[in-house]
């Protein structure tokens, strides 16, 4: 079956820094700001363009090893990312892959927030276990949490 | 805040030399693809030069190919213009413009979103 | 290289009046990511060029919503819905698909 799942979490960062910092360079910059998160980025096919595979590698005592990641889509024009979770982490005997949406749009004080669609191709009559998605969002808000200090911090970048 | 300032323009003979300069500020500049673009007196806009965020890839117009030389100093956060055997016609005025930024997902381009306050160049005897 | 041709190259217009100039481009600015890499910009009297639309109709930071622009492959418009006093100025067309990046040659915006 499918099971959607959606998020919202606001930031003080304008969409079009976020961006930039969380979506367009987040490969560089997240295992820079959270590597207790996130150890490395690699692309294994492609140039970052949709189709790409990346392989994320998770640090050590994580409950995974690594995730491999499809980008579906970037469009730069309306802030709006697609990628699927296609090997590694959850994603096995009980879950054949995870559909994921980040759209950044304009918050009225400035900011922005942040949507997250998750859709979860599960086989057979498996169902999501709401502790995992749970989990899952809370790890998406702390990435953002860092990269949000370190945009703060570092008055320069990503403008 | 984000700006880029021109500066090494002047009076100068056919046949003379400048440096032209533009030191970036309030973003990150080795992320960017940079453009020189010029403006006679009375006339519209021409394009003239770019080169990308490392510096390995540099294009040029027909018009000055062979007598600037565009480049650029990622930890000056500057980029230079190199114009020999100056002509009367390249007397305008020079802007340095930012063009599209790259990252880890790619080069994207967002238009020519900031532009210097110009420089100006006069080729006269 | 890619001819840009602006019409019309004078344009005077009643404040509060719409305003529409047009672009046309020898070949097409259609790129393989989607997107048309034609910009709009607008030069006032004395000051730098500053960019209006990128990509064909996106509006840039800070720009107005008065300003639009439309239009895909050869052919392109920028409209103002309402001209305001300090809409004067030139405008130019600029291709970005290929180098060298080349402008249309102006269209002056002047008020009636």
């Known amino acids: 079956g499918v099971f959607n799942y959606e998020a919202e979490t606001p930031s003080v960062i304008p969409a079009a820094r976020l961006f930039k910092a969380f979506i367009l360079d987040g490969d560089k910059l997240l295992p820079k700001v959270a590597p207790e998160a996130v150890s490395s980025v690699e692309n294994i096919e492609g140039n970052g363009g949709p189709g790409t595979i990346k392989k994320i590698t998770f640090p050590e005592g994580s409950p995974f090893k690594y995730v491999k990641e499809r980008v579906d889509e970037v469009d730069r024009v309306n802030f709006k990312y697609s990628f699927s979770v296609i090997e590694g982490g959850a994603v096995g005997d009980a879950l054949e892959k995870v559909c994921n949406e980040i759209k950044i749009v304009a918050a009225p004080d400035g900011g922005s927030i942040l949507k997250i669609s998750n859709k979860f191709h599960t086989k057979g009559d498996h169902e999501i276990n709401a502790e995992q998605i749970k989990i899952e969002k809370e790890k998406a808000v702390g990435l953002l949490k860092a990269v949000e200090s370190y945009l703060l911090a570092h008055s320069d970048a990503y403008n | 805040q984000v700006q880029l300032v021109e500066s090494g323009g002047g009076l100068v003979k056919p046949g003379g030399s400048l440096r032209l300069s533009c030191a970036a500020s309030g973003f990150t500049f080795s992320d960017y693809y940079m453009n020189w673009i010029r403006q006679a007196p009375g006339k519209g806009l021409e394009w003239i030069s770019l080169?990308?965020?490392?510096?390995?890839?540099?294009y040029y117009s027909d018009s000055v190919k062979g007598r600037f030389t565009i480049s650029r100093d990622n930890a000056r956060k500057s980029l230079y213009l190199q114009v020999n055997s100056l002509r009367a016609e390249d007397t305008a005025v020079y802007y340095c413009?930012?063009?599209?930024?790259?990252?880890?997902?790619?080069?994207?381009?967002?238009?020519?979103?900031?532009w210097g306050q110009g420089t100006t160049v006069t080729v006269s005897s | 290289d890619i001819v840009m041709t602006q019409s019309p190259l004078s344009l005077p217009v009643t404040p509060g009046e719409p305003a529409s100039i047009s672009c046309r481009s020898s070949q097409s600015l259609l790129h393989s990511d989607g997107y048309n890499y034609l910009d709009w910009y607008l030069q006032k009297s004395g000051q730098s060029p500053q960019l209006l639309i990128y990509?064909?109709?996106n509006r840039a930071s800070g720009v107005p919503d008065r300003f639009s622009g439309s239009g895909s492959g050869t052919d392109f418009t920028l409209k103002i819905s309402r001209m305001e006093a300090e809409d004067v100025g030139v405008y130019y067309c600029?291709?970005?698909?290929?180098?060298?990046?080349?402008f249309g040659q102006g269209t002056k915006l002047e008020i009636k």
């Open positions: 413009a930012r063009d599209r930024g790259e990252w880890a997902l790619g080069a994207y381009y967002y238009g020519l979103d900031v």
């Open positions: 990509l064909g109709s």
């Open positions: 600029m291709q970005a698909l290929q180098t060298p990046y080349t």
């Open positions: 080169i990308s965020s490392s510096g390995s890839a540099i």
